[in-house]
C-alpha cells in the first residue's frame, strides 16, 4: 500500500514523487529504507530530497532500492514508499521492456505521444524525439510542449518513441530519456456490438487470500480502427479510479488483432494481497463502443486448499 515503482538510467536525472502526497507546503522527510538513513535536503548532494520530490542528479545503479517518504503533521503522519531501480545504459538500440512506459495508440485523427514523467522536471522546450533510436526529422513530426504530434499517421509509424530533454537544477544540466510504444489503429474496417471473450458471464474466479490475483477483461469490437471502443473494470458499479482501493488497479493490455483481423482490447485487473472483503465485491467487465455496452460479471471465491492423499 502507498508504494510506487520508478525507474531510470544511470548518469541521467531521475525525480520521484512521494506516493503518499500531502498538499504543497507540508514537510516531507525521506529515508533510505534499507538503512533508515535520512536523505539530505542540501542541493549539493547528488541525491537529495526537495519536499515531495526525491532527486537523483544524476542517478547511479547503486541508488536502486526502496525509499520511504513521510509527510509530517503533528496529528497525522503519512508514509509512502518509492521503489527505485536504476539500470545501466544499453550499448545497443534496444529499449528493454522494464524501461518502457505505458503504450499509447493513435490514429490519423489523434496522434499525440506524451513524454512520460516530464511534469516532474524543470525542462525547457523543445523536446527531442527519437523513433527506434533514430532522431525524428521532417515536417510530419511536431514537438509541441510535452508531446509529439505526428501528421498523417501510417501503420509504419508504430514503434518505440523516446523523448529526450534536459533537466536544469541550479544551473546544472542533466539529461533525461523516457520511452513508450506507439501503436497505430487502422482506419479501414467496421464495428460490431462488443463481444466479450473473457471472462464468461457470471464466472466464479477462485483466488487465494493473501496472494495476488489477475482478472482479464477481453473484448472485440469489429475490424480496423474503432472510433470509440473501451474495456474497463468496475467494482460494485464504481469505476476503479473512483473506488479508491490502491490494492486493486487496472492496467491496459496491448491492443490485439487476432488472425481473423478483429480489433480487440484487453484490460487486466490486478488485485494485490487478496483480502476477505474482496470476495464480497462484484467485478464487472465492461465493453462499450458506439453500438452499446456489454457487461460480464465475475465474483471471487476462496480457493480451497488441495487435500493431499497418500
Amino acid at each position: 500500500k502507498f508504494s510506487k515503482q520508478s525507474w531510470g538510467l544511470e548518469n541521467e536525472a531521475l525525480i520521484v514523487r512521494c506516493p503518499r502526497q500531502g498538499k504543497p507546503s507540508y514537510t516531507v522527510d525521506w529515508y533510505y529504507s534499507q538503512t533508515n538513513k535520512s536523505i539530505p535536503t542540501q542541493e549539493r548532494n547528488r541525491v537529495f530530497a526537495s519536499g515531495q520530490l526525491l532527486k537523483f542528479l544524476p542517478a547511479a545503479v547503486a541508488d536502486s532500492g526502496i525509499y520511504t517518504c513521510i509527510v509530517r503533521s503533528p496529528t497525522f503522519n503519512r508514509t509512502g514508499y518509492a521503489n527505485v531501480t536504476i539500470y545501466k545504459k544499453q550499448s545497443d538500440c534496444n529499449v528493454p521492456d522494464y524501461l518502457m512506459y505505458s503504450t499509447v495508440s493513435g490514429s490519423e485523427k489523434n496522434s499525440k505521444i506524451y513524454c512520460p514523467t516530464i511534469d516532474l522536471y524543470n525542462w525547457t522546450a523543445p523536446l527531442e524525439w527519437f523513433k527506434n533510436c533514430q532522431a525524428l526529422q521532417g515536417s510530419r513530426y511536431r514537438a509541441h510542449k510535452s508531446f509529439l504530434v505526428i501528421d498523417n499517421v501510417m501503420t509504419e509509424d508504430a514503434g518505440d518513441y523516446t523523448c529526450k530533454f534536459i533537466h536544469n537544477e541550479n544551473g546544472a544540466n542533466y539529461s533525461v530519456t523516457a520511452t513508450r510504444s506507439f501503436t497505430v489503429k487502422d482506419e479501414q474496417g467496421f464495428s460490431l456490438f462488443p463481444v466479450i471473450g473473457a471472462p464468461a458471464q457470471n464466472e466464479i474466479k477462485e483466488v487465494e487470500i493473501g496472494k495476488n490475483a489477475n482478472l482479464t477483461c477481453s473484448a472485440c469490437f469489429g475490424k480496423g480502427t474503432q472510433f470509440l471502443a473501451a474495456v474497463l473494470w468496475q467494482l460494485n458499479g464504481t469505476k476503479i479510479t473512483d473506488f479508491g482501493e490502491p490494492r486493486i488497479q487496472q492496467e491496459e493490455g496491448q491492443n490485439q488483432s487476432f488472425s481473423n483481423g478483429l480489433a480487440c482490447l484487453d484490460m487486466v485487473l490486478r488485485i494485490a494481497d487478496v483480502k476477505e472483503e474482496d470476495l464480497l465485491l462484484q467485478y464487472d467487465c465492461l465493453a462499450l463502443n458506439l453500438h452499446g455496452l456489454r457487461r460480464h460479471t465475475v465474483r471471487l471465491s476462496r480457493k480451497n486448499p488441495i487435500d493431499h492423499h497418500s
Partner: antibody, heavy 117, light 111 residues
C-alpha cells in the same frame, strides 16, 4: 471526487443513544485519510467529535470521549457515530467529513438531530 | 485543549473593501517550520468549505482574494477585495494536537 452523505433519525429522546451513519462514495474508506464527525448546535460554532482513520484507529474529543464511539463497515463503505446518554445540549447539525491531512476537505450536507422527549 | 478566539465576532464591510479576521490561539500552533492553522467559510445552510491551510496556503479553487498570514499564536484571514457573495461565517481551526478545535466564528456581512 469524494462524496459523503449522513443518515439517521432526526429525533432522539433524552438519555437514549444517537446513531448516525455516513455513506462514502467515490473513495474507499480503507484506502487512506481520516473520516470525521463534527457537530454544530443551531446558531453556534463547530465542534470536532472525533475521527476514524483508514487503518481503523480512532481519535476522540476528550470532552465527549466517554459517550462516543466511531466505527466503520468496510463492506458498505460507511462509518458511523454513536453518542450515548444524550441531552438537549446534543441537539445539533451533525456533519461527516474527510480529513486528508489536517483539514476537513470534503463534507456531507449535514443532518439535524434534535434531542427532545 | 488549545482554545481559539476569533475577533471580531461580526463585521460589516462594503464591496471592494478589505475584511480582516483574526484568530488567537491559547498556545503556539507552529512547529517544525509550519503553522497548523486553517480557515473555513460557511454560508447559511451549507457545510463549511476549506479556504486556507497551514496558515497561508490557498486551497485549490479558492479565489486569490482570500489570504492568510501569521505564526505562533496570532493569525489573520484577509479578504481583499470583498464581494457580495462573501457573506458567511468564517472559522479558524488548528491541528497542532488532539483535540482539533475551531474558533467560535466571525460573521461577515456585506453592506
Amino acid at each position: 471526487q469524494v462524496q459523503l452523505q449522513e443518515s439517521g433519525p432526526g429525533l432522539v429522546k433524552p438519555s437514549q443513544t444517537l446513531s448516525l451513519t455516513c455513506t462514502v462514495s467515490g473513495y474507499s474508506i480503507t484506502s487512506d485519510y481520516a473520516w470525521d464527525w463534527i457537530r454544530q448546535p443551531p446558531g453556534k460554532g463547530l465542534e470536532w467529535i472525533g475521527y476514524i482513520r483508514y487503518s481503523g484507529d480512532t481519535y476522540y474529543n476528550p470532552s465527549l470521549k466517554s459517550r462516543v464511539t466511531i466505527s466503520r463497515d468496510t463492506s458498505k463503505n460507511q462509518f458511523s457515530l454513536k453518542l450515548s446518554s444524550v441531552t438537549a445540549a446534543d441537539t445539533a447539525v451533525y456533519y461527516c467529513a474527510t480529513t486528508m491531512m489536517d483539514t476537513m476537505d470534503y463534507w456531507g450536507q449535514g443532518t439535524l438531530v434534535t434531542v427532545s422527549s | 485543549d488549545i482554545v481559539l478566539t476569533q475577533s471580531p465576532a461580526s463585521l460589516a464591510v462594503s464591496p471592494g473593501q478589505r475584511a480582516t479576521i483574526t484568530c488567537r490561539a491559547s498556545k503556539s500552533v507552529s512547529t517544525s517550520g509550519n503553522s497548523y492553522m486553517h480557515w473555513y467559510q460557511q454560508k447559511p445552510g451549507q457545510p463549511p468549505k476549506l479556504l486556507i491551510y497551514l496558515a497561508s496556503n490557498l486551497e485549490s479553487g479558492v479565489p486569490a482574494r482570500f489570504s492568510g498570514s501569521g505564526s505562533g499564536t496570532d493569525f489573520t484571514l484577509t479578504i481583499n477585495p470583498v464581494e457580495a457573495n462573501d457573506t458567511a461565517n468564517y472559522y479558524c481551526q488548528h491541528s497542532r494536537e488532539f483535540p482539533l478545535t475551531f474558533g467560535q466564528g466571525t460573521k461577515l456581512e456585506i453592506k
